[in-house]
Amino acid sequence: AGVFELQIHSFGPGPGPGAPRSPCSARLPCRLFFRVCLKPGLSEEAAESPCALGAALSARGPVYTEQPGAPAPDLPLPDGLLQVPFRDAWPGTFSFIIETWREELGDQIGGPAWSLLARVAGRRRLAAGGPWARDIQRAGAWELRFSYRARCEPPAVGTACTRLCRPRSAPSRCGPGLRPCAPLEDECEAPLVCRAGCSPEHGFCEQPGECRCLEGWTGPLCTVPVSTSSCLSPRGPSSATTGCLVPGPGPCDGNPCANGGSCSETPRSFECTCPRGFYGLRCEVSGVTCADGPCFNGGLCVGGADPDSAYICHCPPGFQGSNCEKRVDRCSLQPCRNGGLCLDLGHALRCRCRAGFAGPRCEHDLDDCAGRACANGGTCVEGGGAHRCSCALGFGGRDCRERADPCAARPCAHGGRCYAHFSGLVCACAPGYMGARCEFPVHPDGASALPAAPPGLRPGDPQRYL
């Protein structure tokens, strides 16, 4: 068990252009309050689920009236911390939603009017017992600065508040199997407190309040032995000396939870985890309307005027989900062409282009050869965002500035001698071989292995192939 604590430091206009209008005016004075909702885990579905870890509402802040003509300053805040007690272990990873609400104090008929000013959400890792973590979140033109921490309530300790500490009974050491509670060396780890009535012989727990059964035992308190033989044979009324297991329909078969709720089995019944906007045993009741501001990230809410009708969020570009809570990975569509690097900046996409390409999506192929010369008669060839020179014979290198040694690769076969020539190379063949690279043997009967001689030449004539 423990408490999650949230301290709001400031709420006001964020940096950059487009400062928001003050939420209050001389005609309509108002005051702020905050709501925090916590959910375990880092799952994408977090925004859809109820505040399973808990929720809290702050006190109302001081009444604020806008000074005419003045920009909206940081608004006056409620005093104190928002505290969300948690009964079980602290999960270590959690999702949060912090809402800033405005309470208008004008002459409303029927009391004050409330409206949602801003909502921020995030996912974080946090160990219980650690220092305050600072955070800044933006919602539209507003900026919220806050700190948070999770702390264990005695006797719980540890990063998950699952270890329990008790003052030492003996001055020198802790009981068998129990360690000192660092940093409280004068205290000892206490055994976990399982669910009341959990069998000490056949049950155990890994978290306070649970009761898990050892093999061969069953029941909510692990007091019923599992019988492999029949336990329904006639043996007098209502005997309970052995438990038995019988097959049957699953409690969640056919999913009893409506409106997309997820069902989980419990020993005596089932439980529905309802999506945002629904509640009730089977998630059959819709309780959220557009007045509750259910759409995240600037989504437009439509419908939901009466409590029984659902609402629909029309999401701005870059967001999706029934509450616009999921950011679309727009780079996954690979909008940047020609190998450009995609950057999703939230408000816009940017493509960082490779050399030789330009345009919002790197769609323009620049003239790679513009202003680039190839030396010694070489010609420039465009391609792939870089220029390449096709060099004249006898030259090489990126710009054809290097004189090539045509004999370096030993092109003459069968012991032929290579000579560099202004127009290439010449092979002087060893006896018995012929051809431009001395690749063909001359047969003893005077016929060569040449498949066919070029017109005007007889096989066996001395020749030079360039």
């Epitope: 029941g219 329904l232 438990g243 097959p247 049957g248 329909p249 020993p267 005596r268 089932f270």
Partner: nanobody
Amino acid sequence: EVQLVESGGGLVQPGGSLRLSCAASGFNISEHSIGWVRRAPGKGEELVARIYPTNGYTRYADSVKGRFTISADTSKNTAYLQMNSLRAEDTAVYYCARSYYHGYSHGHHYYAIDYSGQGTLVTVSS
């Protein structure tokens, strides 16, 4: 002392109906789930119907779905099983049992029974 007493069994023709009753004492049925388990000759036990009296939620085995209806009257601490369109294969001893979900194993959901009655015989025959 916990007690469950079944009644209402008997001989019935195929297509006929019977209503079984289960009177509970020694505990409050609204705090538990109650099921009807049957054992047919030469077969194992099977939980055919189950009710959570707190919310009236019911589950049925596929073999009886649409023909059997389980209900409970918490003011009388009694559960009922209305059996319609009975078939020869429904012939079995029917036990009222206090049950809770145990878990899923080898392709089946299992329920633990901690108390059951002495059973009532239902025979479907022409």
